[in-house]
Interface confidence: low
């Protein structure tokens, strides 16, 4: 299927202009290749009318142009002074006309309606409100005011000042007569329906002295906005329906093959299971506008989406809607990354998160998708180092490997960690991605002691056992803090042939703290990695206590039971998208978690990867 995308159908009226926008994947080849607009003839050939190389056919001379926007991956064809002869089938495309990189566009130019002289034209979107103005002369001020709809040769009474209301307009129409001295009455019709379209007649008085005014009401279905997003990326639908529906339930639905509209998500708590873990409906602003974010875009997400407002939380005739046509480009710039990552209870996961490589300085975030009601995504960690309190010691966001990917490590896994997580930045919102963490049966590969109590001034050794399959990996210990995990200096890792042969004696990496100080208290991670790609980790908490004459006691790390203040990816989406520079804080509430102490440094801490015998015969 061609990745070029545009409007399937374009309609206009004689004498008017149209602007046709076509989208293409903005690869360097596509950005610089020829763009064209051609008309399909009976023979099947497509005759160029205008191209990006400056060609304009004689038929289009002086009334058409093609503008390329390579940075956006779009080009626009403007055609003015339309005539009925312009109706037909066209293609917008890249390269040569006969190649497949094109999109079919149907253009219909119709004759403008013949309206009686002095007709006022009202053009309003479906579901909106229109106010029809009806002037009258002083002598008709005390007489009956009415609005009729012309149907064929007859006129049907819609409303009058004697309190008649046509049943088709019940509960959505009112006639207003102003105070004395104002010679105009108005008819307000709310929640316009497509069937309201037509010619109306205002009348004041009767007989030969009556005042009449024609009004042509054009009720338009919303023109779908074309949205072109990359596979695996993210799309945001901003829905602004107006203050009049600010307190009405909102929804996003997708038009199906039967041309009905299936609810994707609504504010009443309904959500399509196909979007589980990858959709948020962000709370509405005071003006009633709201947005829906969908991540992890799939080809099957393509289609026409409508947002709207109705007390039932689904599409109903006569209520305002907005429309989008979503195209998902398979030639995606967003790299493939695992959508499901599996870990075992007690073990760890390392999640790779893509971001736009042009935005290496952007702030990185990781949040936990929560499905309750409209969905929300409380931030768990960010690249500035803030971590939610209940994740202290087991969550870290690393800038590595860089160049379009960052890493999030979560260890000490429990079944409660299963769920959907989002990777995002304060930069390009289209690069938001979703990953599902699943907790499966099994044992962690790395084994560390469950709890360690160190004595001030003495030496501490912490062993970390790893299996043969990690023998070729780089092993490390690091001290966890809010701002990351500071790798501790490593000693020589022993004879290399032991690792090649996976000698039984080579399956231990130990951390030595000598002498232990107060600053050494905190979380330590043992981990494996290959270059800048991180593998499994295991965490151990070191408590530091005074030297005792007899016995010792493990001091458990303090854990706050109270839920911390949360930063939540909901209303903050707008700030992310506005790319706030001065203060890229996304959310109103902030919790700065204090550092758990200085980084262990210098020669006091060392990592030794050697035989278990040398470490005092710890179990393997």
């Amino acid at each position: 299927k061609s990745p070029v995308f545009g409007p399937q159908e374009v309609s206009s009226v004689e004498g008017n202009s149209v602007s046709i926008k076509c989208y293409y994947p903005p690869t360097s080849v596509n950005r610089h290749t020829r763009k064209y607009w051609c008309r399909k003839g009976a023979s099947g050939r497509c005759i160029t009318l205008v191209s990006s190389e400056g060609y304009v056919s004689s038929n289009y001379a002086g009334r058409a142009n093609l503008t390329n926007f390579p940075e956006n991956g779009t080009f626009v064809v403007n055609i003015a002074q339309l005539s009925r002869d312009d109706s037909g089938h066209y293609k917008c495309g890249l390269g040569i006309n006969s190649r497949g990189l094109s999109f079919d566009v149907s253009l219909e130019v119709s004759q403008g309606p013949e309206l009686p002289n002095g007709t006022e034209v009202y053009t309003v979107d479906v579901g909106r409100t229109v106010t029809i103005k009806c002037p009258f002369k002083t002598e008709n001020a005390p007489k009956t005011k009415a609005l009729y709809k012309k149907i064929g040769q007859t006129s049907v009474l819609v409303i009058d000042s004697r309190n008649y209301v046509n049943p088709n307009y019940k509960d959505r129409i009112r006639l207003r007569i102003p105070g004395t001295g104002q010679l105009i009455f108005t008819v307000v019709i709310d929640r316009l329906r497509l069937s309201d379209h037509g010619l109306y007649l205002c009348q004041a008085g009767d007989g030969s002295n009556r005042d009449e005014k024609n009004a042509d009401l054009q009720v338009l279905e919303p023109e779908p906005e074309l949205v072109y997003e990359d596979l695996r990326g993210s799309v945001t639908f901003h829905c602004a329906l107006g203050l009049e529906v600010a307190n009405v339930a909102k929804f996003l639905c997708r038009v199906n093959s039967r041309e009905t509209c299936d609810v994707v998500i609504n504010t009443l708590g309904k959500r399509d299971s196909a979007f589980e873990g990858r959709i948020l409906l962000n709370p509405q602003d005071k003006d009633g506008s709201f947005s829906v974010v969908i991540t992890g875009l799939r080809k099957e997400d393509e289609g026409r989406y409508l947002c709207g407002a109705h007390s039932d939380g689904q599409l109903q005739e006569g209520w305002p809607i907005q429309a989008w046509q979503l195209f998902v480009n398979e030639e995606s710039t967003i790299p493939r990354s695992p959508t499901v990552v599996k870990g075992v209870a007690g073990g760890s996961v390392a999640v790779l998160c893509p971001y736009n490589p042009k935005e290496s300085q952007s702030l990185k975030y990781w949040c936990l998708w929560e499905g309750a009601q409209n969905g929300r995504c409380p931030l768990l960690v960010e690249s500035q180092g803030l971590v939610q309190e209940q994740y202290e010691g087991r969550l870290s966001l690393l800038q590595e490997p860089g160049n379009g990917t960052f890493t999030v490590i979560l260890n000490q896994l429990t079944t409660q960690d299963a769920g959907f997580y989002w990777c995002l930045t304060n930069g390009d919102t289209r690069w938001r991605t979703t990953v599902e963490i699943k907790i499966i049966e099994g044992e962690p590969n790395l084994k560390v002691p469950g709890n360690v109590t160190a004595v001030l001034g003495e030496t501490l050794n912490i062993p970390c056992h790893f299996p043969c399959k990690f023998s070729s990996y780089e092993k490390y210990w690091c001290k966890w803090s809010n701002t990351g995990c500071q790798t501790l200096p490593s000693q020589d890792e022993g004879p290399s042939e032991a690792f090649v042969n996976c000698d039984e004696n080579s399956r231990l990496v130990s951390l030595t703290l000598n002498p232990v100080t107060r600053a050494d208290e905190g979380w330590y991670w043992c981990g494996v990695k290959q270059g800048h790609f991180y593998g499994e980790t295991a965490a151990v908490y070191v408590a530091v206590e005074e030297k005792k004459v007899a016995g010792s006691r493990y001091v458990s790390p303090a854990k706050a039971d109270a839920a911390p203040d949360e930063k939540v990816l909901d209303s903050g989406v707008r700030e992310i998208e506005n790319k706030a520079i001065q203060d890229p804080r996304l959310f109103a509430e902030e919790k700065v978690v204090a550092d758990t102490g200085d980084q262990a440094g210098g020669s006091r801490a060392s990592v030794d990867s050697s035989s278990s015998e040398e470490q005092g015969g710890s179990s393997k």
Partner: nanobody, 123 residues
Amino acid sequence: EVQLVESGGGLVQAGGSLRLSCAASGRTFSRYAMGWFRQAPGKEREFVAAIAWSGGAIYYADFVKGQFTISRDNAKNTVDLEMNRLKPEDTAVYYCGSTRDPRVGDKKFYDYWGQGTQVTVSS
């Protein structure tokens, strides 16, 4: 206002063909999609096929499966339904409707209807 008049119905043997036509008159609008629906005795009116104003988008009900073809001629303001390999279960009154709404498969979004034309398929 749009007036719609269907024609072309009648009695036909199973396996035969019919071509229904719908003529639109009055104050027509270029943005109307046209649809065919049918209603068998004692059943609800069901969607058969629809065609966008430009003819660029065509929709068929699942049961059609290549049996029917919808087309339109905007110059003549007509929409036709070519019905082949007719079966007794295709017996119904066939209605032509017009809508400016994108949800062409749903009868409640149609603004105007014709009076219907009877199609009877005998076995």
